[in-house]
């Protein structure tokens, strides 16, 4: 199980309007230039077999790889909003850096990389996906974590 | 086909007890939280509880004490104890697969039993 | 615990017709907001989640909208086949969980 006081976040992290609408901004806009719209990366595969104690888990699992691998190689892009945006959320990742699920996670990592493999097999157009769900990812790392 | 089939619905006196069960076919209860919700005559959907993946199991405030929520993932069935039963009891109830997508989804479902609680 | 409230309670309408349905929060659920569709003696079918996805096989002629505390449920040409009666329910996390799932108390769309 996770050592669930360190998967937690404070709900105030996702109650600030400015942040919170320029991530949906962000969002928006990297989704009109996606042209796949039958993936769909944060969806009920993503969660498959992932009790309630262990989403917060899985989700900085997902938001760290949208960090390093995504939004860092992608930083030049939708601005301004991205200068802003990834601040943010990686300050989420920071406050996340404690939590950590005792046992086995095999299952979680398993659908975490199918994600990963998914955005990596798109190319650049996976990263664009990736931001264009940025609005899942913060909906979804509150609802996991608070 | 995913499934989902309740039974053990009927007639019980105020005070008695009953369970209720969800046969479940085509995913695997390792894999899915399930929820129960009923519906008295006429009346809007109710949350009862859910018990998750890991066995958890969670129930609204005025359930807990009297309903409890179990499952036996090898016959592949989710049950809805309820004790102490009263006439407001009467309704239709309900199982629901809880299919989290970043947020909790309640699909499909399955047909419901009838429980009516009358002396 | 959050209180879903839907109006009309019920209404009545034409094949054709364009129907709006709102929900409204106590409090602010994001999008964190599902539609249902139930007809009688049936159980409810997922239409809408996440305010506005719609699930899958549900008609175009279904969306959804808003976020926060006020919400709409959208039939752009109503079938014959639509005239059910309609729940919202929402999901409040970080609260307990005994009050982590509200429906709303429905709507009736009704044969004009």
């Known amino acids: 199980a996770p050592i669930s006081s360190h998967c937690r976040l404070d709900k105030s992290n996702f109650q600030q309007p400015y942040i919170t609408n320029r991530t949906f901004m962000l969002a928006k806009e990297a989704s009109l230039a996606d042209n796949n719209t039958d993936v769909r990366l944060i969806g009920e595969k993503l969660f498959h077999g992932v009790s309630m104690s262990e989403r917060c888990y899985l989700m900085k699992q997902v938001l760290n790889f949208t960090l390093e691998e995504v939004l860092f190689p992608q930083s030049d892009r939708f601005q301004p909003y991205m200068q802003e945006v990834v601040p943010f959320l990686a300050r989420l990742s920071n406050r996340l850096s404690t939590c950590h699920i005792e046992g086995d996670d095999l299952h979680i990592q398993r659908n975490v990389q199918k994600l990963k493999d998914t955005v990596k097999k798109l190319g650049e157009s996976g990263e664009i996906k990736a931001i264009g769900e940025l609005d899942l990812l913060f909906m979804s790392l509150r609802n996991a974590c608070i | 086909e995913v499934q989902l089939v309740e039974s053990g619905g009927g007639l019980v006196q105020p005070g008695g007890s009953l369970r209720l069960s969800c046969a479940v076919s085509g995913f695997s209860l390792s894999s899915y939280a399930m929820i129960w919700v009923r519906q008295a005559p006429g009346k809007g959907l109710e949350w009862i509880g859910i018990?998750?993946?890991?066995?958890?199991?969670y129930y609204a405030s005025w359930a807990k004490g009297r309903f409890t929520i179990s499952r036996d993932s090898s016959k592949n069935t989710v049950y809805l104890q309820m004790n102490s039963l009263r006439a407001e009891d009467t309704a239709v109830y309900y199982c629901?697969?809880?299919?989290?997508?970043?947020?909790?989804?309640?699909?499909?479902w399955g047909q419901g039993t009838l429980v009516t609680v009358s002396s | 615990a959050v209180v879903l409230t839907q109006s009309p309670s019920s209404l009545s309408a034409s094949v054709g017709d364009r129907v709006t349905i709102t929900c409204q929060a106590s409090e602010d659920i994001y999008t964190n907001l599902a539609w249902y569709q139930q007809k009688p003696g049936k159980a409810p079918k997922l239409l809408i989640y996440?305010?506005?996805t719609l699930a899958s096989g549900v008609p175009s002629r279904f969306s959804g909208s808003g976020s926060g505390t006020d919400f709409t449920l959208t039939i752009s040409s109503l079938q014959p086949e639509d005239f059910a009666t309609y729940y919202c329910q929402a999901c409040v996390y970080g609260n307990s969980a005994d009050s982590r799932y509200t429906f709303g108390g429905g709507t009736k769309v009704e044969i004009k």
């Open positions: 996440w305010a506005s």
């Open positions: 018990i998750d993946i890991d066995g958890s199991t």
């Open positions: 629901a697969r809880d299919r989290f997508v970043g947020v909790d989804i309640f699909d499909p």
